[in-house]
């Protein structure tokens, strides 16, 4: 089994992923592992001299770049929040900051922008990864209300006045809560009709 | 031959201070990040607190945060752990251990022999 | 912090038999861009540190035996020793690297049946 620096007549190597094609010595050489970079080139009798990234620098991938990449931090100008640090072997890990979502995107989010209100009787459509959209507002199911303009507000169950030990006042809607009162108390005048009927 | 060897621990009363040295040898000491971690008897690993190669950057379990305090010496290749206002469930073996990265937040390829730390009346 | 949850907690193993622990992760420790797992695991024999064995959740380090593997992504992991020889009885720990803190799982005691 071949060890890098090793001939290769078909411009190939072996492992794709750890070794590369130098071709001014038509030479298989490694690569360097992630957190590291090449400090001497490989030759016919030597391979990839590998050096640690310094700090606030990264490469994530068996490279063979003779530089790490720098440090970026998350930008909350733009919106970002530090999910998780740089280290030699990732660059830091960002997301839109809560009530935000991702705008702009290139590889990565590079910019993030408030999430819309949904209105009285509608809430935000779950997503299964947050941030990665605007709001999608959707009304509330039946037996359920919400009554503010907000981009994160649930739609809540309606409360049931019996569980209280009280009566149904007035029934719940999709932008209110159902109104209960004391079962001894009289009826308000505009809804007595109603009793009496 | 990479080594790193802990000293400084031993018996302290609640409330007491100790102070850990782990002297390194055969690395590039200050291109590397490194840690401690410690192992109550017979309970799991838990990482206490990380210093970056260059010693801008630290971090603490929430265990210890505000009485521990993390640092390094580059030039004698040297790290230590503060401890103060030291209880009885901080009583454990004292690890230092490197990461292969200048932070912390790593694998850990060498780790010392450890450092008992017991803290009782 | 992310918990790390070691199955099971003991294990007795025949000599030259099949040893499988697993390691799960209470959030995805994969990384997208390189699609890495920031995962370890290391054998602490009595009265030794830790020592490491595998990273990258697959990768063994130098001077390791091959039958140390390990597999797995995302949140569940496990770790292999094919044929259990004497001198790997001890407890194997799995720790995440994801994220600060970093955080290692209780540990499995390795025996041999």
């Known amino acids: 089994q071949a060890v890098p620096p090793y001939a290769s007549e078909n411009q190939t190597c072996r492992d794709q992923e750890k070794e590369y094609y130098e071709p001014q010595h038509r030479i298989c050489c490694s690569r360097c592992p992630p957190g590291t970079y090449v400090s001497a080139k490989c030759s016919r009798i030597r391979d990839t001299v590998c050096a640690t990234c310094a700090e606030n620098s990264y490469n994530e991938h068996w490279n063979y770049l003779t530089i790490c990449q720098l440090c970026r931090p998350c930008d909350p100008v733009m919106g970002l929040e530090e999910i998780a640090p740089c280290t030699s072997k990732r660059k830091t890990q960002c997301r839109c900051q809560p009530g935000m979502f991702c705008a702009a995107w290139a590889l990565e989010c590079t910019h993030c922008e408030l999430l819309s209100d949904c209105p009285p009787g509608t809430e935000a459509e779950l997503k299964d990864e947050v941030g990665k959209g605007n709001n999608h507002c959707v009304p509330c199911k039946a037996g359920h209300f919400q009554n503010t303009s907000s981009p994160s507000a649930r739609c809540q169950p309606h409360t049931r006045c019996e569980n209280q030990g009280l009566v149904e006042a007035a029934p719940g809607t999709a932008q209110s809560d159902t109104t209960c009162k004391n079962p001894l108390e009289p009826l308000p005048p505009e809804m007595s009709g109603t009793m009496l009927m | 031959e990479v080594q790193l060897v802990e000293s400084g621990g031993g018996l302290v009363q609640p409330g007491g201070s100790l102070r850990l040295s782990c002297a390194a040898s055969g690395f590039t000491f200050s291109s590397y990040a490194m840690s401690w971690v410690r192992q109550a008897p017979g309970k799991c690993l838990e990482w206490v607190s990380g210093?970056?190669?260059?010693?801008?950057?630290?971090n603490y379990a929430d265990s210890v945060k505000g009485r521990f305090t993390i640092s390094r010496d580059n030039s004698k290749n040297t790290l230590y752990l503060q401890m103060n206002s030291l209880r009885a469930e901080d009583t454990a073996v004292y690890y230092c251990?490197?990461?292969?990265?200048?932070?912390?937040?790593?694998?850990?390829?060498?780790w010392g022999q450890g450092t008992m730390v017991t803290v009782s009346s | 912090d992310i918990v790390m949850t070691q199955s099971p907690d003991s294990l007795a193993v025949s000599l030259g038999e099949r040893a499988t622990i697993n390691c799960k992760s209470s959030q995805n420790v994969l990384y997208s861009s390189n699609n890495k797992n920031y995962l370890t695991w290391y054998q602490q024999k009595p009265g030794q540190p830790p020592k490491l064995i595998i990273y990258w959740a697959s990768t063994r380090e130098s001077g390791v035996p091959d039958r140390f593997s390990g597999s797995g992504s995302g949140t569940d992991f496990t770790l292999t020793i094919s044929s259990l020889q004497a001198e790997d009885v001890a407890v194997y720990y799995c720790?995440?690297?994801?994220?600060?803190?970093?955080?290692f799982g209780c540990g499995t005691k390795v025996e041999i049946k």
């Open positions: 210093i970056s190669g260059s010693g801008g950057r630290t």
């Open positions: 251990a490197k990461s292969d990265n200048w932070h912390y937040l790593d694998a850990f390829d060498i």
């Open positions: 720790q995440q690297y994801f994220n600060t803190p970093p955080t």
